[in-house]
Amino acid sequence: WELTILHTNDVHSRLEQTSEDSSKCVNASRCMGGVARLFTKVQQIRRAEPNVLLLDAGDQYQGTIWFTVYKGAEVAHFMNALRYDAMALGNHEFDNGVEGLIEPLLKEAKFPILSANIKAKGPLASQISGLYLPYKVLPVGDEVVGIVGYTSKETPFLSNPGTNLVFEDEITALQPEVDKLKTLNVNKIIALGHSGFEMDKLIAQKVRGVDVVVGGHSNTFLYTGNPPSKEVPAGKYPFIVTSDDGRKVPVVQAYAFGKYLGYLKIEFDERGNVISSHGNPILLNSSIPEDPSIKADINKWRIKLDNYSTQELGKTIVYLDGSSQSCRFRECNMGNLICDAMINNNLRHTDEMFWNHVSMCILNGGGIRSPIDERNNGTITWENLAAVLPFGGTFDLVQLKGSTLKKAFEHSVHRYGQSTGEFLQVGGIHVVYDLSRKPGDRVVKLDVLCTKCRVPSYDPLKMDEVYKVILPNFLANGGDGFQMIKDELLRHDSGDQDINVVSTYISKMKVIYPAVEGRIKFS
């Protein structure tokens, strides 16, 4: 019996087609992805093949103005239109709290939404009961397939699930659910989830009875043969893991942002054992036409977005200096504003010993593309912020050793004075440079804000200590020459859309007046 698994993950509100780098589509003839194009391909495969499942491994939420405005209603609407068969909860599905998941998505989805390792307690338990499931048995042709879900247990540090959801260890939670399915004579089981490629592989290895793992969170690109675009494969598709009980378990993921549609064909024997598996992600490029009816629906929904981008978010009573002349040479108040917003967006009081789990932010000055003048009645709009942060990036959470941070700050000024983008703006950090010293030895003082303290204060950076830092995904990926961050980071979790972070902060503060306050000094 043959099953075709079509899968997406980490779509991050890319409902419209995008450029090759998943930013805003500029030249339509070269654009990719989007739900209208995805629907064309899915329908083509459904017509050609008998047993097809369309699955999503989480993080539909967060990433463009679509999510900012529609808050998840767009996800439910278009996933329903594409007739997804199941979805796993990702960490970003909790970005607007549990209510922001229940109302727009859980109550509206016409497909099961899954996670076996999230347990509700207290008053939430009855409110959310049955709205998401640990597993769902689906009819596929004349057979049945069990889909069991899982979600990153780091979600409380990455999003806003509140205090009434407990995120258990994935493997511990999955095994009894898979055992239950086996007891119920369901012999073809897919683990669908959002914990990253390393955990996907562990699940394939450790959870007895799982036949296939469809993952997300780490934006992993797998491919067999010559890759069709810029993404470099982390391994073959499918990636085969030998389980502890000796089975060959295919593990797949389909990069991110709806650029590819994962396509995996599995052959099962009559006892539900995987005989063979093969496939590849399908690049959703312009050779695949956008479905006209879905496209028309997108255009209808788009109207509200255009109206939103010119509405006032808040006011500034000071000039927001985002000029290259400032932000690439010294502390600039636009950099301070953005870093303060980044920290504020990551406030998670999950431990009595810590006032917060993260206190530091770094931001490449070259990523700040425009100032905002306060003399326009102080008004700040989404449109203004899109000029400051035009690249559609995310502000991510990483863990780095102090020694890596020190290298990053040396890199920040290694060729100071040439208006280059690597000059770092900061939050929760006090740095002093001596430019008379040779490159690589110019950081004379580097103090960081404590987290394990009741009264936050600045202490010298310790080289061997591990620190959490919020930074743009551009830097986490080694951009602007920050190769040491990419090479030495100990953990990397994708965060929220950059403009969304700053806009939310401005809306919350209502009136802002960021200052230049001595975060960066020269001796």
């Epitope: 016409k110 009961s129 049955g130 769902k136 689906l138 399915l181 004579n185």
Partner: nanobody, 128 residues
Framework: QRQLVESGGGLVQPGGSLRLSCAAS????????IGWFRQAPGKEREGVSC????????YYADSVKGRFTISRDNSKNTVYLQMGSLRAEDTAVYYC?????????????????????WGQGTLVTVSS
């Protein structure tokens, strides 16, 4: 081989009663949410009543509330639908369906999600 077999259908006069049975072979109904659905000629299939395996919670469509009763006998691996005060508009093919997923009885009956196991159906005709 897993099977759901419905029985008890037939011709009945308006105001009369029938009891439908759904017998399962190949799986234990204790662990399943069970539903009765019906499809009248030219109409969509609709959920009539559902019952859970765990806490025996039930759900009824508004159109049958107070007239129909769902019950289960786990020792016989059978679910019943007692139908009373039957009307002409109750005429339909009645199907039994089962889902081992932990869905609510309401989600099962709507049905919110695809249901994996179905019987072949039994015809109920209400006519004088």
């Amino acid at each position: 081989q897993r099977q759901l077999v419905e029985s008890g259908g037939g011709l009945v006069q308006p105001g009369g009663s029938l009891r439908l049975s759904c017998a399962a072979s190949g799986f234990l109904l204790d662990y399943y949410v069970i539903g009765w659905f019906r499809q009248a000629p030219g109409k969509e299939r609709e959920g009539v009543s559902c019952i859970s395996g765990s806490d025996r919670s039930t759900y009824y469509a508004d159109s049958v509330k107070g007239r129909f009763t769902i019950s289960r006998d786990n020792s016989k691996n059978t679910v019943y639908l007692q139908m009373g005060s039957l009307r002409a508009e109750d005429t339909a093919v009645y199907y039994c369906a089962a889902d081992p997923s932990p869905v609510t009885v309401q989600a099962m009956c709507l049905p919110r999600f695809p249901v994996p196991y179905w019987g072949q159906g039994t015809l109920v005709t209400v006519s004088s």
